[in-house]
Interface confidence: low
């Protein structure tokens, strides 16, 4: 539909500041929360997010569609994404929220349908985790921890 | 099917694996490099990226346009981004590469022109840094370091 896309709601040239609606869990990893947080706080935040994910319908969401009713960038994107839980028992935190692109293509801004001539790709970032390094069996020494950076998808973008 | 934009180069239904061309600095923070890296390696990688940024034309790039010649996702995106250097002398690393959206709107996939009825927004992630915490003047005690998580833009996505 050759027409300026669907962000222009009546009397509104472009979306205003996105603010959470009622009953909406702030799962949006895109929003800039605080400029920085302590490590302990960061790990606590991750645990909270994982808990929120488990309690929300977010994990079940597999639909390639844009939702203009929601304030979160991840659901308003042309390359929308949801979150899955990246689980690894040999890591602290064991569970990490990871972005998962909901479309192979991108949402065509005119038809609001998936368009496979573009491609949704993850935007990766490196996050700090602690790896449990245990000696191979039969275990003789204790497990050690090493701080490492793990690559994780934090969002999706639409490319040609 | 809403088929669209200009990704369909001759004989190519969708972009293949993106691989760097000659003389191209792999500045793409979107690509998944290694699953994980040690902290020291991570800090070294950041220093290398900052050095590459300083030596490339990347910092001067301010144009809202898609470049299909380049392999990097950040230049092929409907919400293209470049990198700036986030400089903070009270932090280690002092310099962090930060994504900067090149468009206020997004690139319209039909016209390849900027379309202000959509909006480019940063995708944020939290990265580990060490903060130098020094007592206020007159300084009596030594400066300490605290590991904190700093929020930084790692890419951009296009929203309605």
């Amino acid at each position: 539909q050759p027409r300026s896309p669907k962000s222009k709601r009546k009397g509104q040239g472009r979306p205003g500041p996105l603010a959470p609606g009622p009953h909406q869990v702030p799962l949006d990893l895109v929003s800039r929360m605080k400029p920085y947080a302590r490590m302990e706080e960061y790990e606590r935040n991750i645990e909270e997010m994982v808990a929120q994910l488990r309690n929300s319908s977010e994990l079940a969401q597999r639909k390639c569609e844009v939702n203009l009713q929601l304030w979160m960038s991840n659901k308003r994107s042309l390359s929308p994404w949801g979150y899955s839980i990246n689980h690894d028992p040999s890591r602290i935190p064991v569970d990490l929220p990871e972005a998962r692109c909901l479309c192979l293509g991108c949402v065509n801004p005119f038809t609001m349908q998936e368009d496979r001539s573009m491609v949704s790709v993850p935007v990766f970032s490196q996050v700090p985790v602690r790896r449990r390094l245990c000696p191979p069996p039969p275990r003789t020494g204790p497990c050690r921890q090493r701080a490492v950076m793990e690559t994780i998808a934090v969002g999706c973008t639409c490319i040609f | 099917q809403p088929r669209s934009p200009k990704s369909k180069r001759k004989g190519q239904g969708r972009p293949g694996p993106l691989a760097p061309g000659p003389h191209q600095v792999p500045l793409d923070l979107v690509s998944r490099m290694k699953p994980y890296a040690r902290m020291e390696e991570y800090e070294r990688n950041i220093e290398e990226m900052v050095a590459q940024l300083r030596n490339s034309s990347e910092l001067a790039q301010r144009k809202c346009e898609v470049n299909l010649q380049l392999w990097m996702s950040n230049k092929r995106s409907l919400s293209p981004w470049g990198y700036s250097i986030n400089h903070d002398p009270s932090r280690i690393p002092v310099d962090l590469p930060e994504a900067r959206c090149l468009c206020l709107g997004c690139v319209n996939p039909f016209t390849m022109q900027e379309d202000r009825s959509m909006v480019s927004v940063p995708v944020f992630s939290q990265v580990p840094v060490r903060r130098r915490l020094c007592p206020p003047p007159p300084r009596t005690g030594p400066c300490r370091q605290r590991a904190v998580m700093e929020t930084i833009a790692v890419g951009c996505t296009c929203i309605f």
């Epitope: 539909q1 027409r3 669907k6 222009k8 | 016209t111």
Partner: antibody
């Protein structure tokens, strides 16, 4: 002046295919969408789909998927519609019409091509 | 699909009379961007359709000012203040707000 010149009438057998053309002149072909519209004898107008010549991108009305295939030849500023597996139901006048991105209206229409499906 | 229903099917008028054609959509055709892509076209016998009105009430260039469009949401009207002989033909409304785009069934304006 701006014109969309369509190919002449076609008489085709059931089950066959036909490719009709729409040649644009007087404007930059790659800047406008080309739409196709069907009009059965004594009936109203039905939108089939569009193609954007700048990129070759297409969008079809669900009803016409598999029936119509839209293509363009930028070098000759010509849009084509291939109609396949024809039946008597496909007998109609087919129009092309252009629209500019950001507007929607069909400001220029083609002359129309009559397709008759008969054995 | 959005169903566009035009009334009347046939409209007999005398030259110089006012004519009014109604078009009703099965759902709101206000696009999410705030625009309403409702057009009116006139098709004379043996000819291609011609654009008269776009976005509900905007007259296309060269269209006489006796033609006017109005309405909102789901109800739209085309008015011809003083019908002339050259106005005779079939009038179609069209919505371009939701895919698939759809035309009304047409209203035939004829001489009484």
């Amino acid at each position: 002046q701006v014109q969309l010149q369509q190919s002449g009438p076609e008489l085709v057998k059931p089950g066959a295919s036909v490719k009709i053309s729409c040649k644009a002149s007087g404007y930059t072909f790659t800047d406008y969408f080309i739409n196709w519209v069907r009009q059965r004898p004594g009936q109203g107008l039905e939108w089939i789909g569009w193609i954007f010549p700048g990129s070759g991108s297409t969008y079809y009305h669900e009803k016409f998927k598999g029936k119509a295939t839209l293509t363009v030849d930028k070098s000759s500023s010509t849009a084509y519609m291939l109609l396949s597996s024809l039946t008597s139901e496909d007998s109609a006048v087919y129009f092309c019409a252009r629209t500019l991105y950001g507007n929607w209206y069909f400001d220029v229409w083609g002359t129309g091509t009559t397709v008759t499906v008969s054995s | 699909d959005v169903l566009m229903t035009q009334t009347p099917l046939s409209l007999p008028v005398s030259l110089g009379d006012q004519a009014s054609i109604s078009c009703r959509s099965s759902q709101s055709i206000v696009h999410s961007n705030g625009n309403t892509y409702l057009e009116w076209y006139l098709q004379k016998p043996g000819q291609s359709p011609k654009l008269l009105i776009y976005k509900v009430s905007n007259r296309f260039s060269g269209v006489p000012d006796r033609f006017s469009g109005s309405g909102s949401g789901t109800d739209f009207t085309l008015k011809i203040s003083r019908v002339e002989a050259e106005d005779l033909g079939v009038y179609y409304c069209f919505q371009g707000s939701h895919v698939p785009y759809t035309f009304g069934g047409g209203t035939k304006l004829e001489i009484k």
